[in-house]
């Protein structure tokens, strides 16, 4: 009878993560008596995957009944495959011996490759907000995929971006890989409602790419424009001055009125109106009792937006045209300063 050969018919097997891998092995003879063992890798550091003789291998099942002497099919199934299972598997026949079984013949090996889906891309923007016309960086990360080949694209509101750099790690062979990409985006005043999208395509996704998004509302700061105007006189000796705070984002805003450099009133924007582009408008007004002033009054609307240095706009109020009321020491009144305006 010819000497036993161990046949592993599959040079490679490709399995999706979570599925079961079947590793085929047959012997050409029933002689010699002895166990079959499966190993991952070769040489002294090889890892025992299955031992017919002894041990507990919960993920491994045999295709046929290996308990019987007349069995020559030593194929195994490994369940719940993960990328860490990738490698070359060897089916090895041992001869019954004393004091130990002796390795008799090995199969040529079967390379197990694992297809693993990338994790959902996570997009993160800059730690601090930036204003329009500035360039900001967004990063996109996805992990745990195999094989290494992967495609990553960036979009802003559906338009593909070109200014980005992508790395896949590690560079060499690995059980699974990670991708890291950084895109540069130029902000505009209209970007409050904009989205940046990172799209990852991989063989495991069957043409249905994964997307991660970042809202530019988390990144952008649109500074307000200020306009101070004097309204028609409401009553004798009273002037209504308004400060229009327009096109700002985010909403966090504090306004201070100054009369000739002295703080008259401070308030926080609450009842704001939202523009179509996502920015906000707000108006504050001040009733000035002109009879309390002998000279012209410099009214200043000072706005601190989102923790940034204050911006201001001033208005010179002429009091010479108005007769002064004696005994009045009230310079200004705060009545209905949060008037709602719709644009």
């Amino acid at each position: 009878e010819e000497e036993l050969q161990v046949i592993q018919p599959d040079k490679s097997v490709l399995v999706a993560a979570g599925e079961t891998a079947t590793l085929r092995c047959t012997a050409t003879s029933l002689i010699p008596v002895g166990p079959i063992q499966w190993f991952r890798g070769a040489g002294p550091g090889r890892e025992l995957i299955y031992n017919q003789k002894e041990g507990h291998f919960p993920r491994v099942t045999t295709v046929s009944d290996l308990t019987k002497r007349n069995n020559m099919d030593f194929s195994i199934r490994i369940g719940n495959i993960t990328p860490a299972d990738a490698g070359t598997y060897y089916c090895v026949k041992f001869r019954k011996g004393s004091p130990d079984d002796v390795e008799f013949k090995s199969g040529a090996g079967t390379e197990l490759s694992v297809r693993a889906k990338p994790s959902a891309p996570v997009v993160s923007g800059p730690a601090a907000r930036a204003t329009p016309q500035h360039t900001v960086s967004f990063t996109c990360e996805s992990h745990g995929f195999s094989p290494r080949d992967i495609t990553l694209k960036w979009f802003k509101n559906g338009n593909e971006l070109s200014d980005f750099q992508t790395n896949v790690d590690p560079v060499g062979e690995s059980v699974s890989y990670s991708i890291h990409s950084t895109a540069k985006v130029v902000l505009t005043r209209e970007d409050v409602h904009s989205q940046v999208i990172c799209e990852v395509a991989h063989v495991t996704l069957q043409g249905d790419p994964l997307r991660g998004t970042a809202n530019l509302s988390e990144t952008i700061r649109v500074p307000p424009t200020l306009e101070v105007t004097q309204q028609p006189v409401r009553a004798e000796n009273q002037v209504n001055v308004t400060c229009q705070v327009r096109k700002f984002y985010p909403q966090r805003l504090q306004l201070t009125w100054l009369e000739n450099g002295n703080v008259s009133r401070t308030e926080t924007a609450s009842t704001v109106t939202e523009n179509k582009d996502g920015t906000y408008n707000w108006m504050s007004w001040l009733l000035v009792n002109v009879s309390a002033h002998r000279d012209d009054v410099k009214l200043t609307c000072q706005v601190e937006h989102d923790g940034q240095p204050a911006v201001s706009k001033s208005h010179d109020l002429k009091v010479s045209a108005h007769p002064k009321e004696q005994g009045s020491n009230t310079a200004a009144e705060n009545t209905g300063s949060n008037e709602r305006n719709i644009y």
Partner: antibody, heavy 118, light 107 residues
Framework: EVQLVESGGGLVQPGGSLRLSCAAS????????MHWVRQPTGKGLEWVST???????YFPGSVKGRFTISRENAKNSLYLQMNSLRAGDTAVYYC????????????WGQGTMVTVSS | DIQMTQSPSSLSASVGDRVTITCRAS??????LAWFQQKPGKAPKSLIY???SLQSGVPSKFSGSGSGTDFTLTISSLQPEDFATYYC?????????FGQGTKLEIK
């Protein structure tokens, strides 16, 4: 059903010969090692002989040179030729299959009695 | 030749008891050890092979353990049909050898 049936036992004088047979059924006979085991009345078990799939044979020192084991795969039959029999060979002789991957004995026949006496 | 020594030679136990029989080899037998049950006038029946593998069709109340030279057969809960003689056998090295047997009797 896997079955082994021994035959050929009987009374024989010391120095005589006897040929035991074992008829196998219910399995592919040629794919298994086969064994003979004996048991003197009221005593323990003693391995007597093995024949491998390829025809290789094995014996303990107590029977070597006196016993021969053979197989006829076409007839699904196992044989034990016993020569120069002694009183100490008196026992029930069992045919057994090395049915497990490691050649452990898994199936036994019912046995046949061999008595060596004058 | 490898000597196989069983202990005890006989054992009295009651139905429901857990019993353990030991078998010692005179040298390392690489776990190639089998256990058999034999009732009077019957052929031996295979219970365990390769020290701990349960033969097909054998109830799980029988279990084998051990390695190297020391092995045990355990019957977890004795039933009337379990009272018999039990043999161990090494089949690592020719000549294959058996233990002298342990007779398990009803107390």
């Amino acid at each position: 059903e896997v079955q082994l049936v021994e035959s050929g036992g009987g009374l024989v004088q010391p120095g005589g010969s006897l040929r035991l047979s074992c008829a196998a059924s219910g399995f592919t006979f040629s794919s298994f090692d086969m064994h003979w085991v004996r048991q003197p009345t009221g005593k323990g078990l003693e391995w007597v002989s093995t024949i491998g799939i390829a025809g290789d044979t094995y014996f303990p020192g107590s029977v070597k040179g006196r016993f021969t084991i053979s197989r006829e795969n076409a007839k699904n039959s196992l044989y034990l030729q016993m020569n120069s029999l002694r009183a100490g060979d008196t026992a029930v002789y069992y045919c057994a299959r090395g049915g497990n991957w490691d050649d452990a004995l898994d199936i036994w026949g019912q046995g046949t009695m061999v008595t060596v006496s004058s | 030749d490898i000597q196989m020594t069983q202990s005890p030679s006989s054992l009295s136990a009651s139905v429901g008891d857990r019993v353990t029989i030991t078998c010692r080899a005179s040298q390392d037998i690489n776990n190639y050890l089998a256990w058999f049950q034999q009732k009077p006038g019957k052929a031996p029946k295979s219970l365990i092979y390769t020290a701990s593998s349960l033969q097909s069709g054998v109830p799980s109340k029988f279990s084998g353990s051990g390695s190297g030279t020391d092995f045990t057969l355990t019957i977890s809960s004795l039933q009337p049909e379990d009272f018999a003689t039990y043999y161990c056998q090494q089949y690592n090295t020719y000549p294959y050898t058996f233990g002298q047997g342990t007779k398990l009797e009803i107390k």
